[in-house]
């Protein structure tokens, strides 16, 4: 989804130095949407570089991005959300490189929050719950969540569970007894909208009980 050329012959004709990526967030601030772009090369000299989006907008032809340190950012209600927009890196009036992007395909949800784990002694299981702001949204309402947990000593040995609800049950027998666990969750669009994983929620830490130990609710550490 990049650039403009006559026939495809100029497929990769833009200067690679200016390649960039973007993500959209819908209803991120009330009914306002946002679009965030950044250069893939952190060493690009961005002093005179601007970003502009044209097409698939309501009431206006083009919008300019605001520069916030090394990222470029728009917050607006003016995204049509149907059709492709042309996002260009510009120096003055000259376009250096452009991408044709449908903003509904680059959606990055907000990170889940309020992650917690409760141990149920009678059921010998752990109930994992979390919240997401998307339950209140009108567009990106349907998400797939990725819950990842690990024993704290196993630095890269994460177990992942995909789910569409905000509640998960982990069986005690699947976990090591008397161990400290870290758990976190992220989200990705799952109906019509496409895009990227959200940032991870803050991690929650819990300890599994000793075998035959009755510890009740799992407290955060």
């Amino acid at each position: 989804e990049s650039g403009y050329a006559q026939n495809g012959d100029l497929e990769d004709a833009e200067l690679d130095d200016y390649s960039f990526s973007c993500y959209s967030q819908l209803e991120v601030n009330g009914s306002q949407h946002s679009l965030t772009c950044a250069f893939e090369d952190p060493d690009v000299n961005i002093t005179n570089l601007e970003f502009e989006i044209c097409g698939a907008l309501v009431e206006v032809k083009c919008l300019n991005f605001r520069k916030l340190q090394e990222i470029y950012f728009i917050e607006t209600k003016k995204f049509l959300l149907i059709g492709k927009s042309n996002i260009c890196v510009k120096v003055g009036e000259k376009s250096l490189t452009c991408k044709k992007i449908d903003l509904t395909t680059i959606v990055k949800p907000e990170a889940p929050f309020d992650l917690s784990v409760v141990y149920r002694e009678g059921a010998n299981d752990f109930v994992v719950t979390f919240n997401t702001s998307h339950l209140q949204k009108k567009y990106v309402k349907v998400l797939m969540h990725d819950v990842a947990y690990r024993q704290e000593k196993d630095e890269n040995k994460w177990t992942h569970v995909n789910l569409s609800s905000t509640k998960l049950t982990l069986l005690q027998r699947k976990l090591q007894p008397a161990a400290m666990y870290e758990i976190k969750v992220r989200s990705i669009p799952d109906h019509y909208f496409k895009g990227f994983w959200s940032e991870w929620s803050p991690s929650y830490y819990f300890r599994t009980p000793e075998i035959n130990n009755s510890s009740g609710e799992m407290d955060p550490i």
Partner: antibody, heavy 118, light 111 residues
Framework: QVQLVQSGAEVKKPGASVKVSCKAS????????LHWVKQAPGQGLEWIGG????????AYNQKFKGKVTLTSDRSTSTVYMELSSLRSEDTAVYYC???????????WGQGTTVTVSS | DIVLTQSPDSLAVSLGERATINCRTS??????????MHWYQQKPGQPPKLLIY???NLESGVPDRFSGSGSETDFTLTISSLQAEDVAVYYC?????????FGGGTKVEIK
């Protein structure tokens, strides 16, 4: 100007295969997905599937899986639709169409008539 | 699959009069204010031509006598003042869910 030019009419025998081409011009080939739509004689329109020329990724109507294969060639800005094991019910006009957005079709080829007859 | 039912099947309207075509879907094709319904015109021997996308957005170059409205499961294409060149078959199409389906078509003729 933006154009999709399709290959000419084909007459095939039952059981044969046919490959229809659609050459894009007037825009950057990898910017837009290209789709195929079937119109049987005197009938309405039926979406077959689409291809993203940038990635080669495809999406098919379940009804046409196994019948249709979509491919693209970035060097010639051309997409192809191959129909296999042809039967009389495959007789139709086949259109390629550019997807201006998800998923509506803002530019259409002129159509390719495929006739299956023994 | 989402079924699109157009009505009427055919329509005869006097020149300069209003023509209205309806399209009903078997399930909602809207996500809040995003209405994934599109309208095409097809003349004999020609490919379809996009008129309206997103229920109400007029495609570039299409005369403004064409307009679209509706949401959820009920959509309408209106030709405010029928011209001779508008004689054609009109199709609606949804794009919320694969397979992307079309209505059966409405034939518009001059009365």
């Amino acid at each position: 100007q933006v154009q999709l030019v399709q290959s000419g009419a084909e007459v095939k025998k039952p059981g044969a295969s046919v490959k229809v081409s659609c050459k894009a011009s007037g825009y950057r080939f990898t910017d837009y997905e290209l789709h195929w739509v079937k119109q049987a004689p005197g009938q309405g329109l039926e979406w077959i599937g689409g291809i993203d020329p940038k990635t080669g990724g495809t999406a098919y109507n379940q009804k046409f899986k196994g019948k249709v294969t979509l491919t693209s060639d970035r060097s010639t800005s051309t997409v192809y639709m191959e129909l296999s094991s042809l039967r009389s019910e495959d007789t139709a006009v086949y259109y390629c169409a550019r997807s201006g957005g998800r998923w509506y079709f803002d530019v259409w080829g002129q159509g390719t008539t495929v006739t299956v007859s023994s | 699959d989402i079924v699109l039912t157009q009505s009427p099947d055919s329509l005869a309207v006097s020149l300069g009069e209003r023509a209205t075509i309806n399209c009903r879907t078997s399930e909602s094709v809207s996500i809040h204010l995003l209405h994934l319904m599109h309208w095409y015109q097809q003349k004999p021997g020609q490919p379809p031509k996009l008129l309206i996308y997103g229920a109400s957005n007029l495609e570039s170059g299409v005369p403004d006598r064409f307009s679209g409205s509706g949401s959820e499961t009920d959509f309408t294409l209106t030709i405010s003042s029928l011209q001779a060149e508008d004689v054609a078959v009109y199709y609606c199409q949804q794009s919320i869910k694969d397979p992307y389906t079309f209505g059966g078509g409405t034939k518009v003729e001059i009365k």
